[in-house]
Interface confidence: low
């Protein structure tokens, strides 16, 4: 079953622009720098038109195929497998002029016992087996090779690693007579890196390990191990960085406690506690040492593992993440929200914001959503006037000198971008919400009222009249 969104581009879009890489000199890869938008932010459309025109004029010089697809490669080492014993793999689109490599870890929840893994295998087999994987995938969002869609790293070598281990990329156990399923998420990443070294990764300058949802948590769990692996294999010059999207969860108190019945309603601490034993899960060594034996589950939570990481990591997290709300048993139905639930939701945003206080590179819009970086419209959301690709570009610049993101941001190039307004969609650039029945787009004020947030209650703590607040929201302040 095709269980996950692919955010594919619509057929009507113009074809992707050709590439602008110059041919590298005698076996020497030429670094291509990210686009610096500082001088052009006022007129981005005109700038993009120029880039596109330049790209098209240079296309005849390029030997690259004009093809957006990433191609499937099953691992040659077939002992590194998906849950069902089929070989794991990756999708690759090379960009020979670039020394940047983006490795993206797919998400898709997890399973933590024989029963819900059996069910997952019956209903979401693509997330447990490579047998039905398509030969190619389209790169979207940060995996796109189109500068309009991916102004950040469109020129990079793109690698999409499908999630087929159901273990939040943490497992290290193979299938056996005793184990019905293999859980090899951590080993899959290691093996993909090993194989990519023979496909050009050995010449990389930067390896960005990115991921969304369970893949975002996978980044936090594996980024230091990848850096260590490359050092041990003799590639200490490759800078390893992490980009964790929608994988920074809180082990907070659920709004309504439920027994650990299934993947979605089970409290995350309990699910991970059970899972880590079932998967033979491994966590970063420095984090593991901070907790007693049996308490390794703590390292799956961003705010606990992050301080122990050596590699620089950029954290992207919606303040009102739908997966977080789901595991907290909060379901927004369009019915009026009781005060207790309203306070719970606002407190969740506040807690999330607090955990990002000491994360210098972060992007956290006050939106109700889940995942962003491989959405085609990932460039649209802004925090304090800065888009995510722009923030990532600033992060790159800040890392030229220091290994861990600097506390003193570059002038006009912020990397710590966390919304401070206190309710879902108080940021006007949040992804569009539609009324489920009419299909009409809703503005922020309509959305808040639709959700049952009384404007008087929302305005009061801000010291505003409801009319003033509505005016501010419609003006995008």
């Amino acid at each position: 079953s095709e269980g996950r969104k692919t955010w594919r581009r619509r057929g009507q879009q113009p074809p992707p622009p050709p590439r602008t890489e110059a041919a590298p000199a005698a076996g020497q890869p030429v670094e291509s720098f990210p686009l610096d938008f500082t001088a052009v932010e006022g007129n981005m459309d005109s700038f993009m038109a120029q880039v596109k025109s330049l790209a098209q004029s240079l296309y005849p010089c390029s030997a690259q195929q004009l093809n957006e697809d990433l191609r499937l490669h099953l691992l040659l080492n077939t002992s590194v497998t998906c849950n069902d014993g089929s070989p794991a793999g990756y999708y690759l689109k090379e960009s020979r002029g670039s020394r940047r490599w983006l490795l993206f870890l797919e998400g898709g929840w997890y399973c933590f016992n024989r029963e819900n893994c059996d069910s997952r295998y019956d209903t979401m087999r693509r997330l447990m087996s490579s047998r039905d994987w398509p030969r190619t995938r389209t790169g979207t969002g940060i995996l796109s090779s189109q500068p309009e869609e991916n102004p950040y790293w469109w020129n990079a070598n793109m690698v999409f690693i499908p999630y087929c281990s159901s273990d939040v990329w943490s497992g290290a156990s193979s299938k056996s007579e005793k184990n019905e399923y293999a859980f090899m998420g951590a080993l899959i990443i290691q093996e993909v890196v090993r194989e990519l070294l023979g496909r050009g990764l050995s010449g990389a300058k930067v390896l960005l390990l990115a991921g969304s949802s369970a893949g975002g948590t996978g980044v936090l769990l594996n980024v230091d191990r990848v850096a260590e692996q490359l050092e041990k294999l003799g590639y200490p010059a490759i800078q390893v960085r992490g980009l964790a999207d929608s994988g920074w969860f809180l082990d907070n108190k659920q709004y309504r406690h439920t027994d650990c019945v299934d993947t979605i309603t089970c409290a995350p601490t309990e699910a991970i506690r059970r899972g880590i034993r079932y998967w033979n899960g491994v966590v970063p060594e420095r984090c593991r040492r901070q907790f007693q034996e049996g308490e390794e589950w703590n390292c799956f939570f961003g705010y606990k593992v992050y301080p122990t990481l050596r590699c620089p990591v950029f954290v992207v997290q919606w303040l009102f993440d739908e997966a977080q709300l789901t595991v907290d048993n909060v379901h927004l139905t369009g019915q009026p929200v009781q005060e207790g639930l309203r306070l719970y939701i606002q407190n969740l945003g506040r807690e999330l914001r607090h955990t990002l206080k000491d994360v210098p590179a972060s992007f956290a819009p006050a939106c109700l959503s889940h995942e962003i970086i491989i959405r085609s419209h990932w460039t649209d959301v802004q925090v304090k006037g800065t888009s995510l690709p722009r923030a990532l570009h600033c992060w790159d610049r800040s890392l030229h000198d220091s290994h861990k993101a600097s506390k003193t941001p570059l002038k006009g190039c912020p990397v710590h971008l966390v919304d401070s307004c206190p309710w879902p969609h108080c940021n006007p650039s949040c992804p569009t919400v539609r009324d489920q029945f009419t299909g009409q787009e809703m503005n922020v004020a309509q959305f808040l009222m639709h959700m049952g947030f009384d404007m008087q209650t929302v305005a009061q703590p801000q010291g505003l009249e409801p009319s003033e607040l509505l005016g501010m929201l419609s003006n995008g302040s």
Epitope: R4, G107, G108, E115, H331, T333, E371
Partner: antibody, heavy 119, light 110 residues
Framework: QVQLVESGGGLVKPGGSLRLSCAAS????????MHWIRQAPGKGLEWVSY????????YYADSVKGRFTISRDNAKNSLYLQMNSLRAEDTAVYYC????????????WGQGTTVTVSS | DIVMTQSPDSLAVSLGERATINCRAS??????????IHWYQQKPGQPPKLLIY???DLESGVPDRFSGSGSGTDFTLTISSLQAEDVAVYYC?????????FGQGTKLEI
Amino acid sequence: QVQLVESGGGLVKPGGSLRLSCAASGFTFSDFGMHWIRQAPGKGLEWVSYSSSGGTTVYYADSVKGRFTISRDNAKNSLYLQMNSLRAEDTAVYYCARASYDGGYFDCWGQGTTVTVSS
Amino acid sequence: DIVMTQSPDSLAVSLGERATINCRASKSVSTSGYSYIHWYQQKPGQPPKLLIYLASDLESGVPDRFSGSGSGTDFTLTISSLQAEDVAVYYCHHSRELPFTFGQGTKLEI
């Protein structure tokens, strides 16, 4: 093969009680959450109640909360629905159904037992 | 509670023609890429029978003329070429959260 057989339905006066049973066979009963779903004559389907595989978590539709009690005996492969303070609007065919994991869909249904509440 | 609304309430289609039934949820029933929507067929005097689960997966043993699609709040059950034995009432059902709810049903006739 997987089989669910309901029993215990019948005619009862308003305010009366009934206990429905569902006998399961052909699968490991203790591994599955179970549901009761009902269908009033000529009407659509209405979810009534749920019991988790171990019986530790139960849920009820608002329309039956406080009057109906779901329970299970995994040793006997049986699911029960104790119905008290019955009303005319509880008249329906009552089905027990097995819940799939994670997806939550009902992949196996019994034939149903009829409950009629009438004076 | 999530309200499931099916359309139309009844549908008459010629043998061999395509039948389409829609189901709309009052809020999204998709999360992390999975759509918790399922379709059942019920014939007179029988219990419902699962046709499609998780929006688009065909239950084993169900003819492949049945298919499901959609995500978020809008879903469709399609019968590509209607057969006489497809006359029944069809229900959509969500399992995104408790309480589970069903659509009111769509009666399909020839």
